[in-house]
Structure formats: structure tokens, C-alpha cells
């Protein structure tokens, strides 16, 4: 073979391409190795002219070799060198956001770095850049403007190599969050009464959404996204209805999967479930909660249980949402159809909070298995979410 080149190089992948041998060959043997990286050898068909190299180490110079085989004969080896990109830092987060200061934190990339370039920019176009040392994983921003949206970006540096930038968006506080993105921000604005509020997805005034805020449970700041209390609302609804939401926010309702996706895409959220039945109460909190977009069929992530109701959501973690007209569960039967509800079903449920109100038949009702089992329909249930770092925000607000 000849003309060995690499293309589409990222921090973990590259595409090797070559001109085929003039003679017909049985196979090509490709090997690649880098400093401190064991050699990997792969054999591919003789009519192949490219090969995807995967699981590469970032910021590493690799030597790529290829030769052709035909029977016992081997061609001469051709060689190419390439260097993988520097991988990006991860999880850039703005915390301790005050009116004029904020703390940026991040996780380092896998590759060693010689420093980081931090860029932060306000909506009025003011840009500041700072280079920090390789062992730094946080940086305090000062002299910010109050009530201002900022975009902070960070890029890892290693000599001439520069990673892709990652970014986070935050808003410095004034007296109020002008466009609260969730109920926690509404609460930090001083609103402490449970009820209907307008939030702005991603703090965008064009993305207004009316929600019910629970401002009392465990410190408040919760967006309620499901309530069951009397059986007046029909929860045996189709995919379109569950995507959009339905019901009366003051009564029984479902906020909508599209809204949940947009809210949980704003940052790290926690889930709280409150249950009541004949004077008994129970709760479950999950410190990581998110809902994917429509392409993932609103895939659920729920981790980090604490509470008194029992960890019934663990069974549903990683599942896509199912309704009677869109069956995404792992059962042969349609769980939503079988149990007259909708949920992130598996095969089928530990939790069925959108089940038939008051139905005590096995698995048909409003169930939370590890509290009341599958043969008792719970009288009152709410699911709600707020940022995982709410406690920190609340504490700082009180100090301020």
C-alpha cells in the first residue's frame, strides 16, 4: 500500500486511509502505538482502504504502520505519524454566583496540560481572558456586572495544542433574577409562597413557562411536574399529550416531557417525590435527575436515592418513556397498555404514578412499590425537581 494518511483526528479517534496495493491482496495489517500506549494490531480485508482508530489517548503522538499480506507474503511497511487532539476539560460550572463575583470550577482533561485559557463574556460584548496554571481546577471571577448573563469558556493548553472549548452560562444576581429559569431562582428572588409562577427556560424571556412552585417542602424551590390527588384528570393519555403536558397546574397535571427535558438540560437537577396516603407520608429524593430529548424518547436518568419511600425509581433508570401508542419498554407486552398509564416503563414497573387513580388491582393503580406495593393505589403523589446545588444557593442568599 502507499499514501498512508490520517484524517478526522479528534482526542480519541482518527481515520487511517491509504492507497491500495497494486496487486490483489488478502488483507492489510494495521498497527498503531503511542508513547506509554501499548501497540494495537488489527487485520482488515484486502479491499479496505480506510480504518477507524478508536479509544485513542488524547494529546499523544501515534505511529501508524500498515502492510499488505497475500498468503505467506508480506509487503513492505508504510508508516505515518499523527497526534491526537488535546481533550477538553469537563463539567465547567459556575457556582457561588453573586452580583459581582462567581466561582468557575472544572474537571481536568485526561491529557496532561500546561495551562488553561479562560474566556468570559457578558451579553454587552465585554470579553476578558485569563490563563491559569495546569493544576488549577477553579477560578474566581471578580468585577462582574450585576444582573448580567455571562458565557464562560475554557480551553486546555499543552504547548501548541489547544482543546475544544467548553462553556457554561450564568447570570450574576441583582436584587432579583430578572428571568428565573426555575422555582429555585424564583424563591431566591424572595417568592416564598407555593403557587403558580412564570419561569424562563435557560433564562430566556422568550421561553416563558407557567409552573407550580412548591416553596415549602424541604426548603422549597421545587418545580412540581406531576400531581395526583383526586382522580379527576385522565392520565391514560397518548405520546403527544405526555410530550406537551396536560391538566390544571393547581390540581392534577403533568408538566410535559419536552418541558422536563428543557429544564433538566439547564444544569444538574434533583428529583423529589412526595407521597401521602391515609395520613401516612413518605418521600424519595434522587440527587441526579434528568430527562433526555425526544430523540432519546425522553430517556430517564435518576440516581442517588435517599428518603423513606424506598428506592423504587432505580428500576426505571436509563429507560425511555412509554405510552400506549408509543411502546419503548423492554417487555413483549405494551406496559402502558397493560397498566393503563404512562411512565419510563421497563418490564414493567416499580413506580406507576401515572396509573389509574384509586385502582387497587395488581400494578394498575398509583403505585410506589417499595412503600405500598402494587396492590394499593396511593391517594396523593407529587414529583418535583430543583437544582442539586439549591442548598448552597439558599445558604449564600441568606448570608447575602
Amino acid at each position: 500500500p502507499s499514501g498512508l494518511v490520517t484524517a478526522n483526528i479528534t482526542d480519541s479517534e482518527a481515520l487511517a486511509r491509504w492507497q491500495p496495493a497494486i496487486a490483489t491482496v488478502d488483507s492489510y495489517v494495521i498497527s498503531y502505538t503511542g508513547e506509554k500506549v501499548p501497540e494495537i494490531t488489527r487485520t482488515v480485508s484486502g479491499n479496505t482502504v480506510e480504518y477507524a482508530l478508536t479509544d485513542l489517548e488524547p494529546a499523544t503522538e501515534y505511529t501508524l504502520r500498515i502492510f499488505a499480506e497475500k498468503g505467506p507474503q508480506k509487503s513492505s511497511t508504510i508508516t505515518a505519524k499523527f497526534t491526537t487532539d488535546l481533550d477538553s476539560p469537563r463539567d465547567l460550572t459556575a457556582t457561588e454566583v453573586q452580583s459581582e463575583t462567581a466561582l468557575l470550577t472544572w474537571r481536568p482533561p485526561r491529557a496532561s496540560v500546561t495551562g488553561y485559557l479562560l474566556v468570559y463574556e457578558s451579553v454587552d460584548g465585554t470579553v476578558k481572558e485569563v490563563i491559569v496554571g495546569p493544576d488549577t481546577t477553579s477560578y474566581s471571577l471578580a468585577d462582574l456586572s450585576p444582573s448580567t448573563h455571562y458565557t464562560a469558556k475554557i480551553q486546555a493548553l499543552n504547548g501548541p495544542l489547544r482543546s475544544n472549548m467548553i462553556q457554561t452560562i450564568f447570570t450574576t444576581i441583582g436584587l432579583l433574577y430578572p428571568f428565573p429559569k426555575d422555582c429555585s431562582q424564583a424563591m431566591l428572588n424572595g417568592d416564598t409562597t407555593s403557587g403558580l409562577y412564570t419561569i424562563y427556560l435557560n433564562g430566556d424571556k422568550a421561553e416563558a413557562l407557567e409552573v407550580f412552585c412548591d416553596m415549602t417542602s424541604d426548603g422549597g424551590g421545587w418545580i412540581v411536574f406531576l400531581r395526583r390527588k383526586n382522580g379527576r384528570e385522565n392520565f391514560y393519555q397518548n405520546w403527544k399529550a405526555y410530550a406537551a403536558g396536560f391538566g390544571d397546574r393547581r390540581e392534577e397535571f403533568w408538566l410535559g416531557l419536552d418541558n422536563l427535558n428543557k429544564i433538566t438540560a439547564q444544569g444538574q437537577y434533583e428529583l423529589r417525590v412526595d407521597l401521602r396516603d391515609h395520613g401516612e407520608t413518605a418521600f424519595a429524593v434522587y440527587d441526579k435527575f434528568s430527562v433526555g430529548d425526544a430523540k432519546t424518547r425522553y430517556k430517564l436518568k435518576v440516581e442517588g436515592y435517599s428518603g423513606t419511600a424506598g428506592d423504587s425509581m432505580a428500576y426505571h433508570n436509563g429507560r425511555s418513556f412509554s405510552t400506549f401508542d408509543k411502546d419503548t419498554d423492554s417487555a413483549i407486552t405494551n406496559c402502558a397498555l397493560s397498566y393503563k398509564g404512562a411512565f419510563w416503563y421497563r418490564n414493567c414497573h416499580r413506580v406507576n404514578l401515572m396509573g389509574r387513580y384509586g385502582d387497587n388491582n395488581h400494578s394498575q393503580g398509583v403505585n410506589w412499590f417499595h412503600w405500598k406495593g402494587h396492590e394499593h393505589s396511593i391517594q396523593f403523589a407529587e414529583m418535583k425537581l430543583r437544582p442539586s446545588n439549591f442548598r448552597n444557593l439558599e445558604g449564600r442568599r441568606k448570608r447575602a
Epitope: 432505580a314 428500576y315 433508570n317 421497563r346 418490564n347 414493567c348
Partner: antibody
Framework: QVQLVESGGGLVQPGRSLRLSCAAS????????MHWVRQAPGKGLEWVSG????????YYADSVKGRFTISRDNAKNSLYLQMNSLRAEDTALYYC?????????????WGQGTMVTVSS | DIQMTQSPSSLSASVGDRVTITCRAS??????LNWYQQKPGKAPKLLIY???NLETGVPSRFSGSGSGTDFTLTISSLQPEDFATYYC?????????FGQGTKVDIK
């Protein structure tokens, strides 16, 4: 690759104690529930005990409750079963098993087992 | 505790046969059922989880079905390496319980 290796089995007299260990490798140990399942010679499988990924929750079969204690050391990727007041009916091959993600009550990886014989 | 009853307890079959093993739970367990294969002197191996889902790496001739209380494991065309003992297990509630096993041997 994912691997579980049990140790600590042996011959023990009734009423005495034994501690089984299971060394895990190839996966993020503290993400998964772990279990002990036993099989008496020529018999079927019997679940003995389980423990959550954090170690905060433990579960036991009635036949061993109060006598056996399951524990884990996530720093060492190790699972343990402390067996006290052993009886002849505890004689079995003891398997360590990894739970799947989520509830962890399905066993997707098993060790090769360690034999416990309780006899005078 | 939930009792799991398998039938038959043993069966003889030839290579290429279609084999069906049933498992019945003493109470309703939705689809919280798993199937394992155990060969002599070896640890059990997970075949099917959640009643009908094939574990990664398990040949497609194995399939599972059922929900509620009645479940079936089917081997569409028995292969020499399939002669073993098969166990069902409910993961619906603690204690997780196994069926008594079905031994599949050569006719």
C-alpha cells in the same frame, strides 16, 4: 474483563464461624449491588444475601438471618460473608454474584464458587 | 416468599429439537423474571432478563416470554452445548427465589 473470585471456604464444625471473601475486578464495584447465592450438593440455587452498592442496605434469606452478615469494602473491591453458628444445612457451594444496574436483583456475573462443608 | 415452580424437572431431547421450559410464580410478578443456564461444575450464566430480554452474547435461539405468573424459556433448535440445567428466578421481591431447575439431557 469482569471477574469475581471467591475464597475462604473449607471444612468447619457445626456452631463455628467462617468468613467468605469475593474479589471483584473489571467494573466499577460501588455502582452495583452484590449478592451471595449458594447451591447445596446436587440441589438447586438459593439466594442467601444481598447488599447495595454503597453498602447502606443489606438483605438476607430467612434461613440465614441473624447468623450471616454481608458487607463490602468498596476501596478494596471486595465483598464478604461472615457466617456464624454454622449448621450442616449450610453446606453448599457459595457463589458471589454481581447485580445488574438499577435494582441489582438480576445476577449477570458469577464467580466460580467456594465450597463450605459443615460437619463434625 | 414467592414460590417458583418449573416444569418439567427434566427432559430428554435431541440436537435440533425445539425445547420449551415453563416457570410459574405463586403470585403476580409482572415481568420480573430471569433465566439462567448452569453446566455441571460451572457457575450459572444469565440468559434472559426481564422475562424476554436476551443477555448480551447469548445466542438468539434462546427466547423468553410471559408476564404475570406464567413464563416460558424456549430453545428453538437445541445445540450440543445447550445440554445443561436451566433455572428461572424472580427478581420482583426479596428474597429473590429460584425455580428448582430443569435438566435438559441428550435423548
Amino acid at each position: 474483563q469482569v471477574q469475581l473470585v471467591e475464597s475462604g471456604g473449607g471444612l468447619v464444625q457445626p456452631g463455628r464461624s467462617l468468613r467468605l471473601s469475593c474479589a471483584a475486578s473489571g467494573f466499577t464495584f460501588d455502582d452495583y449491588a452484590m449478592h451471595w447465592v449458594r447451591q447445596a450438593p446436587g440441589k438447586g440455587l438459593e439466594w442467601v444475601s444481598g447488599i447495595s452498592g454503597s453498602g447502606g442496605s443489606t438483605y438476607y434469606a430467612d434461613s440465614v438471618k441473624g447468623r450471616f452478615t454481608i458487607s463490602r469494602d468498596n476501596a478494596k473491591n471486595s465483598l464478604y460473608l461472615q457466617m456464624n453458628s454454622l449448621r450442616a444445612e449450610d453446606t453448599a457451594l457459595y457463589y458471589c454474584a454481581k447485580g445488574t444496574r438499577g435494582e441489582g436483583d438480576t445476577f449477570d456475573i458469577w464467580g466460580q464458587g467456594t465450597m463450605v462443608t459443615v460437619s463434625s | 416468599d414467592i414460590q417458583m415452580t418449573q416444569s418439567p424437572s427434566s427432559l430428554s431431547a435431541s440436537v435440533g429439537d425445539r425445547v420449551t421450559i415453563t416457570c410459574r410464580a405463586s403470585q403476580y410478578i409482572q415481568g420480573f423474571l430471569n433465566w439462567y443456564q448452569q453446566k455441571p461444575g460451572k457457575a450459572p450464566k444469565l440468559l434472559i432478563y426481564d422475562a424476554s430480554n436476551l443477555e448480551t452474547g447469548v445466542p438468539s435461539r434462546f427466547s423468553g416470554s410471559g408476564s404475570g405468573t406464567d413464563f416460558t424459556l424456549t430453545i428453538s433448535s437445541l445445540q450440543p452445548e445447550d445440554f445443561a440445567t436451566y433455572y428461572c428466578q424472580q427478581s420482583y421481591s426479596t428474597p429473590q427465589t429460584f425455580g428448582q431447575g430443569t435438566k435438559v439431557d441428550i435423548k
